[in-house]
Each structure stands twice: as structure tokens, then as C-alpha cells.
Amino acid sequence: LIIGFGISGRHSITVTTLTSAGNIGEDGILSCTFEPDIRLSDIVIQWLKEGVVGLVHEFKEGKDDLSDQDEMFRGRTAVFTDQVIVGNASLRLKNVQLTDAGTYKCYIITSKGKGNANLEYKTGAFSMPEVNLDYNASSESLRCEAPRWFPQPTVVWASQVDQGANFSEVSNTSFELNSENVTMKVVSVLYNVTVNNTYSCMIENDIAKATGDIKVTDSEIKRRSSLQLLNSRAA
């Protein structure tokens, strides 16, 4: 969480950003809020990126002004027009690329004053893992698969029965580069599993953490997956 203030004494407003993570190949959100103004026409929103000459996006007088927009952001950015009046200056970014990572500045002008805050935008790939019984294996095994990760994550297995156990000796993890030569498919196999136990496959990089659980009993198999972005830490 980053809170910025204007630099002109009493003519300053609070602008707040969140460290954000973008999943490459999807639309992303760069989060920014500010003290609202009652008149939309008095609000100016400028998004800038460190190392980029042109603007990322500009909104003023109640509408987009893309005349000074940098080429790399053409056709890709939008603010939530109907939410600007209530202090939402967040930016939507179409088709996030690895190169979109960096430091952005959300700069706001209203009738109350000016303010800005920086935002660290991380880009990578993350996806839900799916854990299944691996019927190809000679012994009872579990196979954990996740189609897209970047940077290369760590994979850790855990079990409800053997809490604290280290499964690195009885598991094998591989990373297969996907066709666009950036993201990778993650496959991890856990050997010698026992029934009446719940196993968890945890995949994590500096952007996201995902977990795939499987409960194996004599009568049924239950699965559950979750994904958590590691994007709200204080800068």
C-alpha cells in the first residue's frame, strides 16, 4: 500500500495505490484511488511509467485524452469512467505483457489540489493447479499440473497425516516451456501416496501462490484449488 500526498502544502490530496500483479495474456488492473471531487470536469488523471517518454493514459474534462499516449500503450488502456467521480483512478490494461512490469505513477489533479503515488507493477503467469491420481505410475501416485507459470515457481507437497514431512525425495517436478517461449507448464508427481489422506500441491513464485488439494479415500476423491496473489504487501 502506497499513500502519496501533493507537494503544495494545503493544496494537496491523498492518492493511494496498491502493488499489483498482472497475469500475462489477460487484462490487468493497476489500482489507484484518490479523494473524490464533486465535479468530473475538474478531475485530471495521468498515468505514467518510469522509463517511458509518453503518457500511459490521460483522462481530463470528463473524457480520455490520448494525444500524448506512448505507442506501447495505444489501444490497451482504460479508466473506469463511471467510477472516477467517486475517486477511482484505476487503470485497465489490455493483454498484459512481461514488458509492462515496472514503476507507474498515478498523478491526480482536482479542484482540491494535486497528489500522486507510485505503484510497482509485477507481471508473470499463474494458474490453478489440478491434482489427479496418476494411473500411469506403477505405484499409487498423484500428478499436479498447472498450465502457465512465470517466473519459474517452487513446488512443495504436503499431507494432512504427515504434517511437516519433506516430500522432495518422493516427488519429481518438471517445467515445460509453452509455445510462446515465456510461460511454463508445471508438472509434479508425488509417489507412494496412501489412501485416507489429503495431499496438497503448493506452487509459488514472487507473484502468486496456488494450492491444489486432493482427498483420497476408499470410496471417493475430492479436489479443491485456490489461487492467491501476493500483491498487497507494503512497499
Partner: antibody, heavy 115, light 109 residues
């Protein structure tokens, strides 16, 4: 050269199924937003479906539950599986790449649904 | 759902004249996500303008786009014989994910 080539269209009976293909060259399908857009005879353009680089998919209400967009990254090819076809699905189907907008289009493949 | 309404439905002009085509959205559309396409009979559409005002690669400078919010315009400053076609505006980013206008037919007077 950046190019898209559709195939798989034809005459099909109502209720039938068809799979359209779109072979890409000069760029990677899995790095882009890839769309299917259709045009009924004498009518305007209608968006059908998109698959994001991440694999996330979206569909127009008119086809939801009846069509599936997918891709084969190894073949650099986009697909549209169409089931429970109706007369109103008769159209030229185009695949299109969306970067900043739909900048690359195929030549289209014609689907005719008729008994 | 965002509806794009194009006007006029048909525009009859002569070569050398100026053409002004309108696209009105039922609610605000980001300028970045507004595009214009040209389609000739028997051909696939061709991207002309993206980001409301940026010309696509290879598009002559007689084509220009403008507007923001709910009102967008495609202008062809001096019509050439090859410009007579159907023109579509299109938006991205709302449900449905993409929407096209119904088209404006530009015909020779």
C-alpha cells in the same frame, strides 16, 4: 508474413456439429487475443468468441453453451467447435487477431445450416 | 450491454467529397478500445483506426478518427473510388466482450 487461414465450413443440417479451424502463420496464437467473428448473409459483423493468451474464454450470449473456442499451441491453430447448429448460425465465420484492435483477419469460411 | 449505433445507415457521396460517419455508444466507452473497420463485398474487414484516433499500419492519412465517451467519428477527408464500402465501429471491454455497430454503407452518388 502474418496470416490467418480458416477452414472447416460447409453445409450442415440443423442440430448438427462442425469444427472450424484457423491456421496462423507469422505470429504465435497463444500470445494474442484470438477471436471468431461471423457475418450472416447481407448482415453486419457479430462477435462470437475470444480466447485470451492465458487461455481464458468468453462467448456472445447468442452462442453460449453451443460453441467452444480452443487452440492447439503446437499447431499454432485456433478452433471453434459448434454444436446444436441452427439456421441463424448460417454465416461467414472469420478468425481475427486482437492486439490493440483486430488487426489481422482470415478470409472467412462459410457455414450454411439448412435441411 | 453496450450498444453501438452508427449513422447514417447509408451515405451517398461523390469522389473528392468529405465523408463523416458517426458511432454513438449507449454508455461511455474508453477511447483506447474503440476501433473502425472497412469492409468491401466478398472481403474480410480491414482495420482502419484503433484507439479512436490512431491509424493502423498502411492506412492513408485521409482517414481520421476522433471522439470520446459516447460519441465517435470517422472522417474521410477526400473520397477516393476505393473508399466506397461498409464501415463498422467496434468496442472492447464490456459484456459482451466485443460489440460492433450495425455498419454504415458508403456508396457512390
Amino acid at each position: 508474413e502474418v496470416q490467418l487461414v480458416e477452414s472447416g465450413g460447409g453445409l450442415i443440417q440443423p442440430g448438427g456439429s462442425l469444427r472450424l479451424s484457423c491456421a496462423a502463420s507469422g505470429f504465435t496464437v497463444s500470445s494474442n487475443y484470438m477471436n471468431w467473428v461471423r457475418q450472416a448473409p447481407g448482415k453486419g459483423l457479430e462477435w462470437v468468441s475470444v480466447i485470451y493468451g492465458s487461455g481464458r474464454t468468453y462467448y456472445a450470449d447468442s452462442v453460449k453453451g453451443r460453441v467452444t473456442i480452443s487452440r492447439d499451441n503446437s499447431k499454432n491453430t485456433l478452433y471453434l467447435q459448434m454444436n446444436s447448429l441452427r439456421a441463424e448460425d448460417t454465416a461467414v465465420y472469420y478468425c481475427a487477431r486482437d492486439t490493440y484492435a483486430m488487426d489481422v483477419w482470415g478470409q472467412g469460411t462459410t457455414v450454411t445450416v439448412s435441411s | 450491454e453496450i450498444v453501438l449505433t452508427q449513422s447514417p445507415g447509408t451515405l451517398s457521396l461523390s469522389p473528392g467529397e468529405r465523408a463523416t460517419l458517426s458511432c454513438r455508444a449507449s454508455q461511455s466507452v474508453s477511447s483506447s478500445y474503440l476501433a473502425w473497420y472497412q469492409q468491401k463485398p466478398g472481403q474480410a474487414p480491414r482495420l482502419l483506426i484503433y484507439g479512436a484516433s490512431s491509424r493502423a499500419t498502411g492506412i492513408p492519412d485521409r482517414f481520421s478518427g476522433s471522439g470520446s465517451g459516447t460519441d465517435f467519428t470517422l472522417t474521410i477527408s477526400r473520397l477516393e473510388p476505393e473508399d466506397f464500402a461498409v464501415y463498422y465501429c467496434q468496442q472492447y471491454g464490456s459484456s459482451p466482450m466485443y460489440t460492433f455497430g450495425q455498419g454504415t454503407k458508403l456508396e457512390i452518388k
